[in-house]
């Protein structure tokens, strides 16, 4: 107690007792003092620190008629639902002016069945994959020994003999339950039962089998699934986000994926209705009665180019004397790739067909030799990509140009003389 000028006698005439019990117990500590005059406020200390939020009540009883007479002051501290944090040394404290007095200590202890600080948690694991479970318990009284159980069967001969806080499981092939028992001198407490659900392993070796402009055939190797056969596999494809890309470990695609289910076996699937000449990312997961495996990493794939699906549009062919003007527009149908150019074919009645590569221009002027009196001259045009030619247009007859008729404005092109652009009967 703080130094004073008088060896003052402590005003305390009753000190806190001791409480020892199991968790959840409710108890009361009590101290009593006798003072002359105005009674002071009684405070409670735990391990030497004032309890700011103590659940305490103070009762004051005068022992005489005069306020200068003695008072009996009783302070009671209620401990509800005893916890480990409540344990320690308890004292009462009063301030009499600048002097401080503390009572003799009482002790609160905890003793009962073990109490779990950590219990095994439900989780999912891939078949035949190692994992750990945790369990931690404390008294008092100590020591606390643990015994692990798998599907209600003890994993050691006696508590404390097997694994303690952490149980290493090398792998499971079926969904199992785990719990742990905590043993101390007071008895046994059993933890919650954790269900460990065995899911299929992640599929491996996802790869491309064949490619077509609008479909991809993919295959994979299934992972182990324990005693549970696979029911199906799910494949997801998503358009690659230009510039963004799906990184190998990225959890979600940038947009809603195209999802397909495959019956298994075989572990193969044809993905149709895709865009030609387009990068995709694909991944696969397989499911058993216990649930789905984790997804594979995203695999980048690409559909090949295809040929244009339609001919060029709005072809017009007119002729004015020894010149023929032909022009057209890009096909409306999908190109299925990068347009590389156009091919033009023309033919007269009873004459062989002549083919020309026009490049990416959409018009051409042909310089005809002779008087151009050949009859029934027709022109066809086709677009092409790196994958080949698209369909040819229907033959368009070369019409004579009439004054007032619009004529395309373009650079006059004289076709090269080799091969000579001439009709043998002219």
């Amino acid at each position: 107690a703080p130094r004073g000028t008088q060896a003052e006698e402590s005003p305390f005439v009753g000190n806190p007792g001791n409480i020892t019990g199991a968790r959840g117990l409710t108890g009361t500590l009590r101290c009593q003092l006798q003072v002359q005059g105005e009674p002071p406020e009684v405070h409670w200390l735990r391990d030497g620190q004032i309890l700011e939020l103590a659940d305490s009540t103070q009762t004051q009883v005068p022992l005489g008629e005069d306020e200068q007479d003695d008072w009996i002051v009783v302070s009671q501290l209620r401990i509800t639902s005893l916890q480990l944090s409540d344990t320690g040394q308890y004292q009462c404290l009063v301030f009499l002016g600048h002097q401080t007095f503390v009572s003799q200590p009482g002790y609160v202890g905890l003793e009962g069945l073990p109490y779990f600080l950590e219990e095994p948690e439900d989780r999912t694991v891939a078949a035949n994959t190692p994992f750990n479970l945790s369990c931690q318990a404390q008294g008092p009284p100590e020591p606390v020994d643990l015994l692990w159980l798998q599907d209600a069967v003890p994993l050691a001969t006696a508590p404390g003999h097997g694994p303690q806080r952490s149980l290493h499981v090398p792998g499971l092939n079926k969904t199992s339950s785990f719990s742990c028992e905590a043993h101390n001198a007071k008895g046994v407490t059993t933890s919650r039962t954790a269900t460990i659900t065995v899911l299929p392993q992640q599929p491996r070796n996802l790869h491309l089998v064949s490619r077509q402009p609008t479909e991809l055939e993919v295959a994979w190797t299934p992972g182990l699934s324990g005693i549970y056969p696979l029911t199906h596999c799910t494949l997801q494809a998503v358009l690659s986000d230009d510039g963004m890309g799906i990184q190998a470990g990225e959890p979600d695609p940038p947009e809603e994926p195209l999802t397909s289910q495959a019956s298994v076996p075989p572990h193969q699937l044809r993905l149709g209705s895709l865009h030609p000449h387009t990068p995709y990312h694909i991944r696969v997961a397989c499911t058993s009665s216990q649930g789905p495996s984790s997804w594979t990493h995203w695999l980048p794939v690409e559909t090949p180019e295809g040929v244009p699906l339609g001919p060029p549009e709005n072809i017009s062919a007119t002729r004015n004397g020894s010149q023929a003007f032909v022009h057209w527009q890009e096909p409306r149908a999908p190109l299925q790739g990068t347009l590389l150019g156009y091919r033009l074919a023309y033919q007269g009645q009873d004459t062989p067909e002549v083919l020309m590569d026009i490049g990416l221009r959409q018009e051409v002027t042909l310089e005809l030799q002779g008087d151009g009196s050949v009859s029934n001259l027709t022109v066809c045009v086709a677009a092409y990509t790196a994958a080949g030619d698209g369909p040819w247009s229907l033959p368009v007859p070369l019409e004579a140009w009439r004054p007032g008729q619009a004529q395309p404005v373009h650079q006059l092109v004289k076709e090269p003389s080799t091969p000579a652009f001439s009709w043998p009967w002219w």
């Epitope: 002359q36 105005e38 301030f95 002016g97």
Partner: antibody
């Protein structure tokens, strides 16, 4: 409001005694301890002692134990300090100060204006 | 007795700036989880006025410009921003043990 009234000055001869008074108002006199503090000109503060007006209980600074006697008159809500065997060292301003309780302990929250004691022949 | 040493003995601070006064105790003034340290202001010809109790709690009617901090043996009083009216003597005081003791005081002058 809380007030502690003290006489302004006392002139006393060496070897004599002086009884300083402090009249309290504005609160229940018996509910708070009363302190006495000494301050010499241009110097620090020294705590002399305190008294519980409800029962007369006192706590003293050992240095002043034989010099200062603390008493109260509850009927007039007045605290007294008798200072004996005065010497020039006892020339100082003497304050009474009430102990107001913070949540857990006393702090001197209200002070009188002080009495200037001059010891001179 | 517990000895309290204040520093500096005096300081001059410009209006609106921060003033910091330190107080060191010869032994810890903490007990029961409380720091038994108070701060007082004394203007010329007046009694001391309680500014801070229990190291950091403001006394009744004390402006928020006055802040106390610290624990154990080292404590400080901060005044920010200082005002003309803050010219005074400042004392720390411990009330952990009998007798309560005071620091030697710090004179604050406003420039």
């Amino acid at each position: 409001q809380v007030q502690l009234q003290q006489p302004g000055a006392e002139l006393v001869k060496p070897g004599a005694s002086v009884k300083l008074s402090c009249k309290a108002s504005g609160y229940t006199f018996t509910s708070k301890w009363m302190n006495w503090v000494k301050q010499r000109p241009g110097q620090g503060l020294e705590w002399i002692g305190e008294i519980n007006p409800s029962n007369g209980r006192t706590n003293h600074n050992e240095k002043f134990k034989s010099k200062a006697t603390l008493t109260v008159d509850k009927s007039s809500s007045t605290a007294y300090m008798q200072f004996s065997s005065l010497t020039s060292e006892d020339s100082a301003v003497y304050y009474c100060a009430r102990s107001g309780y913070g949540k857990y302990y006393s702090a001197m929250d209200y002070w009188g204006q002080g009495t200037s004691v001059t010891v001179s022949s | 007795d517990i000895v309290l040493t204040q520093s500096p003995a005096s300081l001059a601070v410009s209006l609106g700036q921060r003033a910091t006064i330190s107080c060191r105790a010869s032994e810890s003034v903490d007990n029961y989880g409380i720091s038994f340290m108070n701060w007082f202001q004394q203007k010329a010809g007046q009694p001391p006025k309680l500014l801070i109790y229990a190291a950091s709690n403001q006394g009744s009617g004390v402006p928020a410009r006055f802040r106390g901090s610290g624990s154990g043996t080292d404590f400080s009083l901060n005044i920010h921003p200082v005002e003309e009216d803050d010219t005074a003597m400042y004392f720390c005081q411990q009330s952990k043990e009998v007798p309560p003791t005071f620091g030697g005081g710090t004179t604050l002058e406003i420039k």
